[in-house]
Interface confidence: medium
Amino acid sequence: AGHLEQPQISSTKTLSKTARLECVVSGITISATSVYWYRERPGEVIQFLVSISYDGTVRKESGIPSGKFEVDRIPETSTSTLTIHNVEKQDIATYYCALWEAQQELGKKIKVFGPGTKLIITDKQLDADVSPKPTIFLPSIAETKLQKAGTYLCLLEKFFPDVIKIHWQEKKSNTILGSQEGNTMKTNDTYMKFSWLTVPEKSLDKEHRCIVRHENNKNGVDQEIIFPPIKTDVITMDPKDNCSKDANDTLLLQLTNTSA
Amino acid sequence: AIELVPEHQTVPVSIGVPATLRCSMKGEAIGNYYINWYRKTQGNTMTFIYREKDIYGPGFKDNFQGDIDIAKNLAVLKILAPSERDEGSYYCACDTLGMGGEYTDKLIFGKGTRVTVEPRSQPHTKPSVFVMKNGTNVACLVKEFYPKDIRINLVSSKKITEFDPAIVISPSGKYNAVKLGKYEDSNSVTCSVQHDNKTVHSTDFEVKTDSTDHVKPKETENTKQPSKSCHKPKAIVHTEKVNMMSLTV
């Protein structure tokens, strides 16, 4: 089955610059399928823009200005790129790539979409570091004692733009855990958001990760915030040498003792 | 030009109570097009739900039912037993037939219908209230309450800033909420909640322990390290005494 990944969840540009949005195709050979690009402007319907077929033919929607969008594909990396030239305010939108995935029955095919990339246009000069800054909260003793469960909370602050994705996993597992989150809130020129995960007592002795995707993460990789295991008797901490966990680094977690 | 028009912009649904979304086609006969439904959830993920002729996306067949009503020129999507996971914007879209019956493979979308999910009407439930702290940050966690109306107060004389609470549906079909704030005196902050004409305090839930059980940490354990250095904690820490963690990146 075809699967589409758009690694950039957002792309921030200043006026008149060029934006390049990527779409990675897996599960199907890119040179044997057509890739479509759609856009969703705020408050408008999702609209087809341009496609590149398996033989390289490009088809643009009528009414789309020529020279505005360019689409190509790189079979070696199984990637299609949408290039938006001379970005202007009216290009602010979420851009989706898509492909038709044929089912195993006659006439049965579906169009699957990538997760989208939001194009943001700003005239602001922002601080050098506008990546999400994490603060973590461990379960209160009262909750673990009374409810045989514990809630981890992951607070992310001082990031720009506002587009952010947060999910939770246990260490050594790729299963995404069911979590809850607040709305993204504006604080001065940046944003904050928090997400929380409630786990049963039997899972408190496992390490958990709050995984954050943001355009301005260091090295462009997901930030992983480690929540140590909570044992009912004792825990030992064994962080690695580096302080922030981008990809394979580990965050320093400094325990502070309180009697709650 | 054809247009797909959703019946409603917003549809509130209750958990477990079937709901129907409708989308009418203007300017053409719906029979000349194949109808598709998609759902966009938080984070913009566009997921395929249904395409005419009983094609369903993974995990949708048991809880969704798509149909077209040729006579009324309508596309219909039924959510048979909504859950909190079904919240999102629902889009109808059609594949188009070009001139002379030639098939073209772009989709034409309608505007989305925002589906908001509410818990089923149920007996009132009093919340549990817990406080979590880290440095100047305090979070008040309010769990498993019904109905939704609630006021959460973080009680402090030295407020730096407070944020609006997040109120969400819990997996059990009640509500959970979290309110965050920053306070100079975070150690003394408590949380009080007004719900259903009653007040619930975080202190009501604190675990009573013997005074001998309050083991003071060694100085080294409780010292914040400079932001660029990384140290291993030197001792085993009894987690029963720990509900805070500070982070230096």
Partner: antibody, heavy 123, light 107 residues
């Protein structure tokens, strides 16, 4: 206008292979909006859909369970036709065989039919 | 497989009569039903698709209705050329299946 022209033998011996061809004019076997089907009709079974083929950036086939182990439907883009092969036939396969176009815009209903070929399975 | 059952199997009527043929599906097929007419020694001819849409060139005295499991084909005023066998076909899920037919004869 679209037409389908069938060809193939009217008599096949038991255990042998029944082979029929359907030539398309006025449409393409690689059309994005059509499926190409084989149907048979006998007094005992009535109308019975056997299977079909269609092209949507690659070729797909779908067959009726009753004949799945014995049937092959092949498109031929060079001659713009499609064929039916039914292996290991028995007298129960005696029927009139039709090819037909299933049209996307008609929700796969069969709007164009071949003239039919009466096939008798007998030694 | 979805079973399609037509009733009646035989029907005698006169020119000018209003005739109704019923088709029942063993499970819901939404509106994905077609009706065909077949005269002796001829190929089937498509009359109606998606339960109620008339194929181009088919006289308006033919109409179809229904959805789910119950469908009807109505001929409002029988003409001499309408005496034939009529078949319904479900196109909702594979394998496509036909009804056993309704033979419409002159009374």
């Amino acid at each position: 206008q679209v037409q389908l022209q069938q060809s193939g033998p009217g008599l096949v011996k038991p255990s042998q292979t029944l082979s029929l061809t359907c030539a398309i004019s006025g449409d393409s076997v690689s059309s994005n909006s059509a499926a190409w089907n084989w149907i048979r009709q006998s007094p005992s079974r009535g109308l019975e859909w056997l299977g079909g083929t269609y092209y949507r950036s690659k070729w797909f086939n779908n067959y009726a369970v009753s004949v799945k182990s014995r049937i092959t439907i092949n498109p031929d883009t060079s001659t713009n036709q499609f064929s039916l092969q039914l292996n290991s036939v028995t007298p129960a396969d005696t029927a009139v065989y039709y090819c037909a176009r299933g049209e996307w815009g008609l929700r796969d209903a069969f709007d164009i039919w071949g003239q039919g070929t009466m096939v008798t399975v007998s030694s | 497989d979805i079973q399609m059952t037509q009733s009646p199997s035989f029907l005698s009527a006169s020119v000018g009569d209003r005739v109704i043929i019923t088709c029942r599906a063993s499970q819901g097929i939404h509106s994905y039903l077609a009706w065909y007419q077949q005269k002796p020694g001829k190929v089937p001819k498509l009359l109606i698709y998606v339960a109620s849409t008339l194929q181009s060139g088919v006289p308006s005295r033919f109409s179809g209705s229904g959805s789910g499991t119950e469908f009807t084909l109505t001929i409002s005023s029988l003409q001499p050329e309408d005496f034939a066998t009529y078949y319904c076909q479900q196109l909702n899920s594979y394998p496509w299946t036909f009804g056993q037919g309704t033979k419409l004869e002159i009374k």
